[in-house]
Interface confidence: low
């Protein structure tokens, strides 16, 4: 009803003589804000109907005092009892130590103002510590994780207990193999009070039938224990034996498979055999109780391998270990593997002889183009630096103590190398003349793989007619040497070939050797004929003056040059190809005026009153720069021109006249020329 109190605690609390009991307890008063005024704990209590009061042995009695705060814990200990609760909602108690005669009902009497309540609490206290309980699953299988729980309906702070696990009397700890975990827990609530330990592990099939014990300890002293026996279900455990494990071809072998153990037991002994993981069929078998025999007659090499047997129970199939059967036989037909192939010249090449044999081959014979290679008896043949002559077919023969094999397949070693002995060949008429058309061919001795392209240097020197053929149209006199390359995956260059183009002498010119300055009459003059280049180099020199051949030779010499030597000179150089003429070179000889003479116009007999012009004619280089005129008496007529004009003429002008001419070289004088002036008819008439 609304006037009832609510009090919660475990239905029964368990302990043993000398231990303690902690009673977890919660309460609610009918009045929400009521506070506990008095608390009593009775042992073996009764209700006195006359006095309407509870009587019995009081184990604990506490009343609120003025000093107590509103809701503080009482924390008062009276004898063996400690009240651990408060005045609001907690009525937890602890009795320490507990006695066996404390078994039965305790009465917890609580008063809050006008509200009162009596709560029975049942204790079960034994004289000796009681056994723990062990919980385990209904079925345990090998290698599958399983959890065992050991527990005790007891927990009391101040009296610590420890739960320990043992397998066949050996303590199990968290580091024991196959143990996943051991976890302990303590529960003390208003519903339950207990201590538990959980052991999680993966049992082995060999753990079947072993005892597992849980032990309760306090202060290193064993209080109680419980033991259970493991029933581990596992697949059949088989043992395989082979006799012999190594056998020569055509002999027989017996294999035995025994069922050593199984839980649950086998319903029927049905043993299956496997080789290299595959079931064996059509084999001679002998089945006995708990045993099966496999007999292999006339063993072949295909019978070598790993054998095992298998049998099943309700849990599943069980397998034996694998046992290897080795069948000895002579080497099988061999084949050769080449790494790398094709190989590059100079590379390291490895040839491996592959031949199945048991025992492994101990001796190998290698063949190159079916001829034995002396000295190499290993499985691997190494060519440190391969060359073209290593190419060809390789085979090998393997040998062991049972005999030797046969050659199954030869392997071809292909050696790749750049084209060898590359040359550039001129295929033209010789000598090659400037302006000719020239054909060049690129040749090589051998190549592997075949030549796929050609290159020419200098690039663009001609046009490629077809692979490996170059045509140079109109070859120049100064053509560069030409080189070709033949290429597969690599290029090999030929030495450059010189075209040796023949041409007429080039850049012919006249050089004045001496004198260093201007040439004057009477001096020694030396001219040289010069040229830049000529092919062939053998040449002849010729000199021409004003277009006419004057002499042969490289030099033209004048011992005492005269004005008559002046003119246009050409030097000409020729070889077997042609001749080349220099540009004209003008020889100028400088000399003083010479061959001076006075000429009179219109004649040397002129009538008075007329005009006469006297000209001073001469030969001079450079021309005369100054003239002087003289009469018959040697009188300077003070005229400096080339011409002397007399006008009008008088008879007195009759006489001889001379002229003198001067240039930068010297002076020349003419012989006298006579002018006769005669009287005119008028003058004669007057007389």
């Amino acid at each position: 009803s609304a006037n009832d109190w609510t009090v919660d605690h475990p239905q029964t609390l368990f302990a043993w003589e000398g231990a303690c009991i902690r009673i977890p307890c919660k309460y609610k008063t009918p009045l929400p804000k009521a506070r506990l005024d008095n608390i009593l704990l009775f042992q073996n209590y009764e209700f006195d109907k006359a006095t309407k009061k509870f009587t019995g042995t009081v184990l604990y009695n506490a009343t609120k005092t003025e000093k107590d705060p509103e809701s503080e814990l009482y924390l008062s200990k009276q004898g063996r009892v400690t009240f651990l609760g408060n005045r609001i909602d907690n009525c937890t108690l602890k009795i320490h130590p507990i006695r066996a005669n404390d078994s039965g009902n305790l009465g917890l009497r609580m008063t809050a103002g006008t509200e009162r309540w009596m709560e029975p609490i049942h204790l079960n206290v034994s004289e000796k510590p009681f056994q723990p309980y062990i919980q385990m699953p209904s079925e345990i299988r090998e290698s599958q994780s399983v959890t065992l729980t050991c527990g005790l309906n007891f927990s009391c702070f101040g009296y610590d207990i420890l739960l320990k696990w043992f397998l066949e009397d050996s303590e199990i700890t968290s580091i024991t193999s196959s143990v996943t975990s051991i976890t302990s827990s303590v529960t003390s609530s208003i519903k339950n009070v207990y201590t538990e330990s959980k052991l999680t592990f993966q049992p082995k099939w060999t753990d079947h039938g072993k005892s597992v014990k849980c032990q309760v300890q306090h202060s290193s002293k064993v209080l109680s224990e419980r033991t259970v026996r493991l029933d581990v279900k596992y697949t059949p455990k088989l043992e395989i034996k082979v006799n012999p494990t190594e056998v020569e071809k055509n002999n027989s072998v017996t294999m035995t498979c025994r069922v050593n153990s199984s839980n649950p037991k086998l319903r029927t002994v049905a043993v299956s055999w496997f080789k290299d993981g595959r079931p064996l069929e059509d084999q001679e078998l002998e089945q006995e109780q708990q045993m099966s025999k496999l007999i292999l007659h006339s063993v072949t090499k295909d019978m070598r391998g790993k054998y095992r047997c298998q049998a099943s129970n309700d849990i599943g199939p069980g397998e034996s270990e694998e046992v290897e059967l080795t069948v000895h036989y002579a080497p099988e037909p061999s084949r050769v593997h080449i790494y790398p192939s094709p190989a590059e010249e100079g590379q390291s090449v490895e040839l491996i002889c592959e031949s199945l044999a048991s025992p492994s081959a101990t001796n190998y014979t290698w063949y190159h183009n079916r001829k034995p290679i002396p000295g190499d008896t290993q499985e691997k043949l190494r060519i440190p630096k391969v060359s073209p002559w290593h190419a060809g077919n390789y085979s090998c023969l393997a040998e062991n103590r049972l005999g030797h094999g046969k050659i199954d397949q030869e392997a071809k070693l292909d050696v790749h190398y750049a084209p060898k002995a590359v040359t550039t060949v001129i295929q033209s008429f010789t000598p090659i003349l400037e302006g000719d058309s020239v054909t060049l061919v690129c040749r090589y001795n051998s190549s592997n793989p075949d030549v796929t392209s050609y290159r020419w240097n200098p690039q663009g020197s001609g046009s490629v007619l077809k692979p490996g053929v170059l045509r140079i149209q109109k070859v120049t006199w100064d053509s560069m040497p030409v080189s070709c390359a033949a290429c597969n995956h690599k290029c090999s260059w030929a030495l450059p070939v010189i075209l040796n183009v023949h041409y007429a002498p080039r850049d012919v010119k006249v050089l004045k050797v001496s004198p260093a300055s201007e040439i004057r009459a009477g001096q020694r003059v030396l001219l040289q004929c010069d040229f830049a280049e000529s092919n062939p180099a053998e040449v002849r020199f010729f000199w021409k003056k004003n277009g006419s051949l004057v002499q042969e030779g490289r030099y033209l010499s004048f011992g005492s040059v005269s004005p008559e030597d002046s003119g246009n000179y050409n030097c000409m150089v020729n070889n077997s190809i042609g001749e080349t003429l220099s540009q004209a070179w003008n020889l100028q000889v400088l000399y003083a005026p010479r061959r001076l003479r006075v000429s009179i116009s219109p004649g040397d007999h002129v009538m008075e009153g007329k005009k006469a012009t006297l000209s001073c004619e001469s030969d001079a280089n450079p021309p005369i720069s100054q003239y002087t005129w003289f009469d018959s008496s040697g009188q300077d007529l003070h005229s400096s021109g080339q011409k002397l004009r007399l006008e009008p003429l008088e008879v007195q002008h009759t006489g001889s006249y001379r002229c003198k001419g001067t240039n930068g070289i010297g002076t020349g004088e003419s012989p006298p020329s006579t002018l006769t002036v005669y009287y005119s008819p008028e003058t004669i008439g007057k007389r």
């Epitope: 790494y339 790398p340 590059e344 440190p384």
Partner: antibody, heavy 120, light 112 residues
Framework: QVQLQQPGAEIVRPGTSVKLSCKAS????????MNWVKQRPGQGLEWFGA????????RYNQEFKGKATLTVDTSSTTAYMQLSSLTSEDSAVYFC?????????????WGLGTTLTVSS | DIVMTQAAFSNPVTLGTSASISCRSS???????????LYWYLQKPGQSPQLLIY???NLASGVPDRFSSSGSGTDFTLRISRVEAEDVGVYYC?????????FGGGTKLEIK
Amino acid sequence: QVQLQQPGAEIVRPGTSVKLSCKASGYTFTDYWMNWVKQRPGQGLEWFGAIDPSDSYTRYNQEFKGKATLTVDTSSTTAYMQLSSLTSEDSAVYFCARSDYTYSFYFDYWGLGTTLTVSS
Amino acid sequence: DIVMTQAAFSNPVTLGTSASISCRSSKSLLHSNGITYLYWYLQKPGQSPQLLIYQMSNLASGVPDRFSSSGSGTDFTLRISRVEAEDVGVYYCAQNLELPWTFGGGTKLEIK
């Protein structure tokens, strides 16, 4: 264990030559090729060439053929690379690296490298 | 010469995640003998290069199985399944199908 020991640094003047060394130990010297690899500061790797110590057979990267000459001294199990006509372009770290005879030819052990500085 | 091409930097990866590094060759490295002559080397800071993978997919001795490599004749990928701090460095691919042996320019593995 296999070790390839190289001097830490070399400083030379332009126009001169230098001979870098690589001392091999921990294996049969004549059973493996010795390679030389160049690495300019902050740059990638360039293969210079290789030498077979068993017969001094050489393979060069044509780009460097005039620059480098590879030799070995089998008595001291040392490989050498001589670099000639040095310029600043030759300043780099030079590694020696071992490779096997087979076609796989990968560089399985490397020296710590010699830093070459060409400076006037 | 066979040219090996690599990106200079990888995409930044978080420790514990996977990373991929690519490499391309100018010519197929698949030999007629079925072997692909492609190699991967790792150069950790301040150290010599070390071999990781030989003949495209074979793990060198002592290299963790976090490393793997695959590819065709010309395109190759190095994978690191769970990147660790010690994997930092420059990864070089290399070929030895033909002389001269050549290396890629290297890819620097970057950690976020």
